[in-house]
């Protein structure tokens, strides 16, 4: 049964050209996480992280992509075009899928809020 | 259009140490993918041994941990293989390869590496 | 380690024959497996990743399929140039494994 629960940094805003990070977080379950995958809005993968193999980065974005924090990602030199949704998709043993969401919002420089609690300044 | 191209000795004395050479052409060994050794044994079965990340990062068969390096030169474009305490059963055909989320998408043309005294 | 088991080791077909190949796997990899194609002398060609998605290039008579630990690779209207040995390898953990090959041969 599965009974882990995937907390997210939920819907974040970050400034165009600046960097931000996205994180989720498998809680209340023991299973062990084999591998993390980080997809975009539009269910490209941005990258891999496995238990055993380590991080892949999609070369695509291997120059604005960086592996971490954790099983994290940063998003570095934001475009407006990085408006949109992004998922983190965990596989587990013996639990199997989970999935989180996280919804971020590029803001023009002048008006962008420092609302993400995750966010690099 | 990126080529990978392997070299090295074809015959290694038990006990010594292999050495092989991937040259790539095409495309910068720094500058994404992975770059994997893999083998082709007389019988027909393929073995992966390990690979170097664009960044350096290295990742091995953990069968072969004890006795393999890979490493690159990146001023050459090229990345390498060495293999410790070589035994005849390390005889088989080396190719070099790019991976891409762990599968491999271009492949060298392989050379063979007989280990006899 | 992750165990490949390929069945058959080996098979005859002819020109214009449909011909599948299954990939057993010891432990669940979701969609992680690639299929590769070797001519004799020649080095492994990709056919297909993720299961099912044909690498470029790939003539449309190769489909992949299947998940966890039960995959196939089908050629519809097998051609001259399809004859060699097959391969299964899975990229879900530390070894890569790949299948011991099939063997496909003209009839």
């Known amino acids: 049964m599965m009974t882990g629960t995937i907390e997210t940094t939920g819907n974040i805003s970050a400034k165009k050209g600046g960097s931000v990070i996205l994180q989720c977080h498998l809680s209340s379950t023991m299973a062990q996480v084999t591998q993390v995958n980080w997809e975009q809005h539009d269910h490209s993968l941005l990258a891999i992280r496995n238990a055993e193999l380590g991080w892949h980065i999609y070369p695509a974005f291997k120059d604005r992509v960086a592996p971490g924090p954790g099983l994290g990602l940063t998003l570095q030199s934001l475009t407006m075009n990085d408006t949109g949704e992004y998922f983190c998709t965990y596989h587990t043993y013996p639990d199997g899928t989970y999935r989180g969401r996280i919804f971020l919002e590029v803001l023009e420089s002048s008006v962008a809020e420092h609302s993400a609690r995750f966010q690099i300044p | 259009d990126v080529q990978l191209q392997e070299s090295g000795p074809g015959l290694v004395k038990p006990s010594q140490s292999l050495s092989l050479t991937c040259t790539v052409t095409g495309y910068s060994i720094t500058s994404a993918y992975d770059w994997h050794w893999i083998r082709l044994f007389p019988g027909h079965i393929l073995e992966w041994m390990g690979y170097i990340s664009y960044s350096g990062n290295t990742i091995y068969n953990p069968s072969l941990k004890s006795r393999i390096s890979i490493t690159h030169d990146t001023s050459k474009n090229h990345f390498f293989l060495k293999l410790n305490s070589v035994t005849t059963e390390d005889t088989a055909t080396y190719y070099c390869?790019?991976?891409?989320?762990?599968?491999?998408?271009?492949w060298g043309a392989g050379t063979t590496v007989t280990v006899s005294s | 380690d992750i165990q490949m088991t390929q069945s058959p080791a080996s098979l005859s077909a002819s020109v214009g024959e449909t011909v599948t190949i299954t990939c057993r796997v010891s432990?669940?990899?979701?969609?992680?497996l690639a299929w590769y194609q070797q001519k004799q002398g020649k080095s492994p060609q990709l056919l297909v990743y993720?299961?099912?998605t044909l690498a470029e290039g790939v003539p449309s008579r190769f489909s992949g399929s299947g998940s966890g630990t039960q995959f196939s690779l089908k050629i519809n209207s097998l051609q001259p140039e399809d004859f060699g040995t097959y391969y299964c390898q899975h990229n879900y953990g530390n070894p890569l494994t790949f299948g011991a090959g099939t063997k496909v041969e003209l009839k």
């Open positions: 432990e669940h990899i979701y969609n992680y």
């Open positions: 390869a790019r991976g891409s989320f762990w599968y491999f998408d271009v």
């Open positions: 993720n299961a099912k």
